[in-house]
């Protein structure tokens, strides 16, 4: 229904009357409408609702509403529908995040690793290796490392110490004479490999594929996460050049990429879920920071002086 009434607070725009050449100041139309007839010396402008498939976000003096962005490509879903007041906005479904306007599944942290930061619709999950006293026995994109069962609190002893991948195994001690009784203290310590980690802050990665072969050897690379890229470690007795070589031997699917970070270059080991052929399960584009906001927000390149 065309609307002629002007609000007191509404802005104005200038319009040149084609018949007279006169510059007129007209009231803008509200968001969700457009100017179907400009004002004249004797009449107010006329506003009409944006037709289906078009929108105007703000009060305006434009003669045609903007076309909505095209439908969201699968598997994206509509975050905001195309309506008179809003453009269509697309986002990735739960369990996926947006990268270069495509959706990639959230990384699954392998056994021995837990979620450090939950994934969102714009950022991947960040994994971290389970710290001493914690473990993760299932690959997951949502679960954190869990604390070992406290055997002593249940009046039990640790029969088998936990690792990054397994919980403590609790049990009762058979009655021994005091001379042969094992010391419970020694049983509670995890394996030495589990107690020490060596960090080299410059080696960074995101899990790629993480199939059984890779995850078995992933203990040599411990993610501590920066942005959506995960930071790892290699033994500190290797030189940086040698370190790169060794990590690549251990994890053959690592890709080495250069990544500018601050004033200096950082060396990044990028680990993505296997995308052997498609390049699409994880975006094959260079790593960028997570894209924020609606990918099409700048696509209406025409700037209309009568809008806003």
């Amino acid at each position: 229904q065309p609307e002629q009434k002007a609000s007191n607070l509404i802005g104005t725009y200038r319009h040149v009357d084609r018949a007279t050449g006169q510059v007129l100041t007209c009231d803008k139309c509200p968001a969700g409408t457009y100017v179907s007839e400009h004002c004249t010396n004797t009449s107010l402008r006329v506003c009409s609702s944006c037709p289906v498939g078009t929108f105007t976000r703000h009060e305006n003096g434009i003669e045609k509403c903007h076309d909505c962005s095209q439908p969201c490509p699968w598997p994206m879903i509509e975050k905001l529908p195309c309506a008179a007041l809003t453009d269509r906005e697309c986002t990735c479904p739960p369990g996926m995040f947006q990268s270069n306007a495509t959706c990639a599944p959230h990384t699954v942290c392998p056994v021995g690793w837990g979620v450090r930061k939950k994934g969102t619709e714009t950022e991947d999950v960040r994994c971290k290796q389970c710290a001493r006293g914690t473990f993760s026995d299932v690959p997951s994109s949502v679960m954190k490392c869990k604390a070992y069962t406290d055997c002593l609190s249940q009046n039990l002893v640790v029969i088998k110490p936990g690792t990054k991948e397994t919980d403590n195994v609790c049990g009762t001690l058979p009655s021994f004479s005091s001379s042969t009784s094992p010391s419970p203290g020694t049983a509670i310590f995890p394996r030495p490999e589990h107690m020490e980690t060596h960090e080299v802050p410059s080696s960074t990665y995101v899990p790629k594929g993480m199939n059984s072969t890779e995850s078995n050897s992933s203990a040599s690379v411990r993610p501590k996460v920066l942005s959506s890229i995960q930071e790892g470690t290699v033994p500190d007795n290797t030189s940086s050049a040698r370190g790169k070589e060794d990590v690549n031997k251990t994890l053959p699917n690592l890709q080495v990429v250069n990544h500018q970070q601050g004033p200096h270059h950082r060396h990044i080991l990028k680990l993505l879920p296997s995308m052997e052929a498609t390049g699409g399960e994880k975006s094959s584009t260079p790593i960028k920071g997570p894209k924020r906001g609606h990918p099409r927000q700048n696509l209406h390149k025409h700037f209309d002086i009568n809008e806003h």
Partner: antibody
Framework: EVQLLESGGGLVQPGGSLRLSCAAS????????MSWVRQAPGKGLEWVSV????????HYADSVKGRFTISRDNSKNTLYLQMNSLRAEDTAVYYC?????????WGQGTTVTVSS | DIQMTQSPDSLAVSLGERATINCKSS????????????LAWYQHKAGQPPKLLIH???SRASGVPDRFSGSGSGTDFTLTISSLQAEDVAVYYC?????????FGGGTKVEIR
């Protein structure tokens, strides 16, 4: 080696049921969209169904909606297709396939024959 | 639903010659936000599962010989085999993955003349 292996096909009477399985190995199964695609004798490829990595979302072709159910068990690295109320036109080789921006890994297929 | 139409239905080409297969979608599969065409090409040999050749309309899948190339944008796409080899005898399918249901073209059978 990345592999998908289907099983569960066979001969079934119209109105009957069958459950297909697809065992995945060599990749992080829980990280991928998985689909079923079929090919009827002498016909082209037809997409049947897709399931999201977590299993939380599923979609079906109109031709099977309400009769087929796709599911997955990420702990067992296995994809399933439960087929009920089978019809003669469901006779086909059924493939499971990995991926959403192009299906990059396919199983060898399992044959389903619906006939009285 | 997006309909995919392939032409020709079959094609006989001499060894070493160029083979061209066309695919037309009933609506655009180009997403302007990332400038990607949501289209794939597959090769399907008798007795084998289909094999992904091309994704994003023009990106070759890993391990695919460079005699295979994909081109086109929007609604019109082409798969080209620059120099046909005996092992290329197969049925070729295009597939859109822009929207559900995912749809395939009817297939083009490539034979040796």
């Amino acid at each position: 080696e990345v592999q998908l292996l289907e099983s569960g096909g066979g001969l079934v009477q119209p109105g009957g049921s069958l459950r297909l399985s697809c065992a995945a190995s060599g990749f992080t199964f829980s990280q991928y969209m998985m689909s079923w695609v079929r090919q009827a004798p002498g016909k082209g490829l037809e997409w049947v169904s897709v399931i999201y990595p977590s299993g939380g979302s599923t979609h079906y072709a109109d031709s099977v909606k309400g009769r087929f159910t796709i599911s997955r068990d990420n702990s067992k690295n296995t994809l399933y297709l439960q087929m009920n109320s089978l019809r003669a036109e469901d006779t086909a080789v059924y493939y499971c396939a990995r991926g959403h921006y192009g299906m990059d890994v396919w199983g060898q297929g399992t044959t389903v024959t619906v006939s009285s | 639903d997006i309909q995919m139409t392939q032409s020709p239905d079959s094609l006989a080409v001499s060894l070493g010659e160029r083979a061209t297969i066309n695919c037309k979608s009933s609506q655009s599969v180009l997403y302007s936000s990332n400038n990607k065409n949501y289209l794939a090409w597959y090769q399907h040999k008798a007795g084998q599962p289909p094999k992904l050749l091309i994704h994003w309309a023009s990106s070759r899948a890993s391990g695919v010989p460079d005699r295979f190339s994909g081109s086109g944008s929007g609604t019109d796409f082409t798969l080209t085999i620059s120099s046909l080899q005996a092992e290329d005898v197969a049925v070729y399918y295009c597939q859109q993955f822009y929207s559900l249901p995912l749809t395939f073209g009817g297939g083009t059978k490539v034979e040796i003349r």
